[in-house]
């Protein structure tokens, strides 16, 4: 067990041009607060995945009012550290998200309004017990400077907080098989203590407080033999040779405990051990109130006027979770057909199609054009066993991805000069010719061989070919 500590040093405009506008004004004073979310391993730092290592919310910073005309300075910060306690081993590699939130203190109906100012994310390696690590992250025009460290809570020590130390019982040496606890040489490594009551015959542990069962045994303390009499038990069948030794889904599968709670099986059901600040059967009730601004991503907080009554976050579309902290994984609905791969871009879904299919959801079987979509408004044409793209004006190449040079084919007749234009080409005709491609001679008496130039356009003026 231990604590991850985050110290915010400054939040303000980053270097370079384009300084951001101050988030507060005389009409709308505001104050900042921060949220940190930690995940184990070098996982994706997507904001929507749960903060499996824990999360913390800072206190509110001092109220700030912008001085008119002044550039945004470093904004006043909340006091103190953000602390994220962790119960188990420190993973050594972790991903973080640090969000800077603005609380507007104007005359909003229904209390203060919260909005996300900046979100930074990263992946780091960090040994517990080491010195403070300094970091600078940029989010748009904003810059966040901070330090962080992980420290073990006694009696845990080591880079992962998995070794336990106890004061020496004898002044000279540690007990049999136990080493001195570097760097605390006056202490000794304690033997690994499994969960209280863990069966010494059928259970074992690799980390303190854990109880893992040998094959054939189950239950929180590995005291319950797995049934071998029938493969119809609700815990699921195994191979014919071993009967039903491998447990199927248990009450803790999928972790029913919310907000970083850890689950342990009980004889009849499960039990959640909740992190600080949460309680309830599934750690769903929080000591946090709506005044703490617990709803993220624009969620609306309702109820929870005092710490004993739960608040509810009403999430905007695209977000879910007790704090609106999870983005709805719209790709889990498998909207892309025919083997297409799904991307949730936040503002939209995109399907990457396999050859042979196209369309927003890869729903069109392009047998004629065999999986070839043409870019930039081009259309697919089949012929002679091969496809080609008939490209819209201004584009060329195999998929119409290349900007064509409309003048390459020398489209202007009779010595006219060609100019590329964003919408096509323009021909500047030589004296005596007119038309979109300078194809019509102007008769000496001023009449043209085809309809006269539009009003206001003199023969010989550049004509745009669209």
């Amino acid at each position: 067990a231990g604590v991850f500590e985050l110290q915010i040093h400054s939040f303000g405009p980053g270097p370079g041009p384009g300084a951001p506008r101050s988030p507060c004004s005389a009409r709308l004073p505001c104050r900042l607060f921060f949220r940190v979310c930690l995940k184990p391993g070098l996982s994706e730092e997507a904001a929507e995945s749960p903060c499996a290592l824990g999360a913390a919310l800072s206190a509110r910073g001092p109220v700030y009012t912008e001085q008119p005309g002044a550039p945004a300075p470093d904004l006043p910060l909340p006091d103190g550290l953000l602390q994220v306690p962790f119960r188990d081993a420190w993973p050594g590699t972790f991903s973080f998200i640090i969000e800077t939130w603005r609380e507007e203190l104007g005359d909003q109906i229904g209390g203060p309004a919260w909005s996300l100012l900046a979100r930074v994310a990263g992946r780091r390696r960090l040994a517990a017990g080491g010195p403070w690590a300094r970091d600078i992250q940029r989010a748009g025009a904003w810059e966040l400077r901070f330090s962080y460290r992980a420290r073990c809570e006694p009696p845990a020590v080591g880079t992962a907080c998995t070794r336990l130390c106890r004061p020496r019982s004898a002044p000279s040496r540690c007990g049999p098989g136990l080493r001195p606890c570097a760097p605390l040489e006056d202490e000794c490594e304690a033997p690994l203590v499994c969960r209280a009551g863990c069966s010494p015959e059928h259970g074992f542990c690799e980390q303190p407080g854990e109880c893992r069962c040998l094959e054939g045994w189950t239950g929180p303390l590995c005291t319950v033999p797995v049934s071998t009499s029938s493969c119809l038990s609700p815990r699921g069948p195994s191979s014919a040779t071993t009967g039903c030794l491998v447990p199927g889904p248990g009450p803790c599968d999928g972790n029913p405990c919310a907000n970083g709670g850890s689950c342990s099986e009980t004889p009849r059901s499960f039990e959640c051990t909740c992190p600080r600040g949460f309680y309830g059967l599934r750690c769903e009730v929080s000591g946090v109130t709506c005044a703490d601004g617990p709803c993220f991503n624009g969620g609306l907080c309702v109820g929870g006027a005092d710490p004993d009554s739960a608040y509810i976050c009403h999430c905007p579309p695209g977000f879910q979770g007790s704090n609106c902290e999870k983005r709805v994984d719209r790709c889990s609905l498998q909207p892309c057909r025919n083997g297409g791969l799904c991307l949730d871009l936040g503002h939209a879904l995109r399907c990457r199609c396999r050859a042979g299919f196209a369309g927003p959801r890869c729903e069109h079987d392009l047998d004629d054009c065999a999986g070839r979509a043409c870019a930039n408004g081009g259309t697919c044409v089949e012929g002679g066993g091969a496809h080609r793209c008939s490209c819209a004006l201004g584009f060329g190449g195999r998929d119409c991805r290349e900007r064509a040079d409309p003048c390459a084919a020398r489209p202007c007749a009779h010595g006219g000069r060609c100019y590329a234009h964003f919408s096509g080409l323009v021909c500047a005709c030589a004296p005596g010719y007119m038309g979109a491609r300078c194809e019509f001679p102007v008769h000496p008496d001023g009449a043209s061989a085809l309809p006269a130039a539009p009003p206001g356009l003199r023969p010989g003026d550049p004509q745009r070919y669209l």
């Epitope: 994706e44 057909r337 025919n338 083997g339 791969l341 991307l343 949730d344 871009l345 995109r350 990457r352 199609c353 396999r354 050859a355 042979g356 299919f357 196209a358 079987d365 065999a370 999986g371 070839r372 979509a373 043409c374 870019a375 190449g397 195999r398 998929d399 119409c400 991805r401 290349e402």
Partner: antibody
Framework: QVQLVQSGAEVKKPGASVKVSCKAS????????IHWVRQAPGQCLEWMGW????????EYASKFQGRVTITADTSANTAYMELSSLRSEDTAVYYC?????????????WGQGTLVTVSS | DVQMTQSPSSLSASVGDRVTITCKSS???????????LNWLQQKPGQAPKLLLY???KLESGVPSRFSGSGSGTDYTLTISSLQPEDFATYYC????????FGCGTKLEIK
């Protein structure tokens, strides 16, 4: 036109890592998958993996899992392939390739290849 | 992992000949979407591979019609109806139904 230009040849010692770059022009790498394929002297072509630069998703061949990392810098329109714990049998020409517009599984455009030699 | 076995590994032929190269997969390449993701590529010495056919028989843009492909399930064939001097190269099959696996190539040489 669509082009993939790879970084120059590299000589590495066993146990080291190599990072090969693949700069795209004529298209935005966010629109397509970038694949990496290698060819050891006199050997078969081997697909190593791909990246979807739009969101950073990657898929690796099981043979290279844990040793290869494919990344992309969309602002530079460039993809990278890093192979670690090099051994002599990693001596090969490494190619990047990209798919066709919207069809992520076709290897249509190829880089010129980067020769990586692993020798003590 | 899917294995792709190409045969022959090398082949000598003359300009004008009709040539057939086969590729056998260790499992069916028919995707659940009804398509079969088998490609053929050509590689000349010192050059990167070039896509010739995809979806078994579809000619890539700009590829001459003397190249054709056929097959289903686990057995596939590339046919060059009348060899031209520029066709002497190494040919690879590539399946992309189950990730990506190349065959080991057939080297087509001048007799």
């Amino acid at each position: 036109q669509v082009q993939l230009v790879q970084s120059g040849a590299e000589v590495k010692k066993p146990g080291a890592s190599v990072k090969v770059s693949c700069k795209a022009s004529g298209f935005n790498i966010k629109d397509d998958y970038i694949h990496w394929v290698r060819q050891a002297p006199g050997q078969c072509l081997e697909w190593m993996g791909w990246i979807d630069s739009e969101n950073g998703d990657t898929e690796y061949a099981s043979k290279f899992q844990g040793r290869v990392t494919i990344t992309a810098d969309t602002s530079a329109n460039t993809a990278y392939m890093e192979l670690s714990s090099l051994r002599s049998e990693d001596t090969a020409v490494y190619y990047c390739a990209t798919s066709s517009y919207w069809s992520y599984d076709l290897l249509v455009y190829w880089g010129q290849g980067t020769l990586v030699t692993v020798s003590s | 992992d899917v294995q792709m076995t190409q045969s022959p590994s090398s082949l000598s032929a003359s300009v004008g000949d009709r040539v057939t190269i086969t590729c056998k997969s260790s499992q069916s390449l028919l995707h659940s979407n009804g398509k079969t993701y088998l490609n053929w590529l050509q590689q000349k010495p010192g050059q990167a591979p070039k896509l010739l056919l995809y979806l078994v028989s579809k000619l890539e843009s700009g590829v001459p019609s003397r190249f054709s492909g056929s097959g289903s399930g686990t057995d596939y064939t590339l046919t060059i109806s009348s060899l031209q001097p520029e066709d002497f190269a190494t040919y690879y099959c590539l399946q992309t139904t189950h990730l990506y696996t190349f065959g080991c190539g057939t080297k087509l040489e001048i007799k």
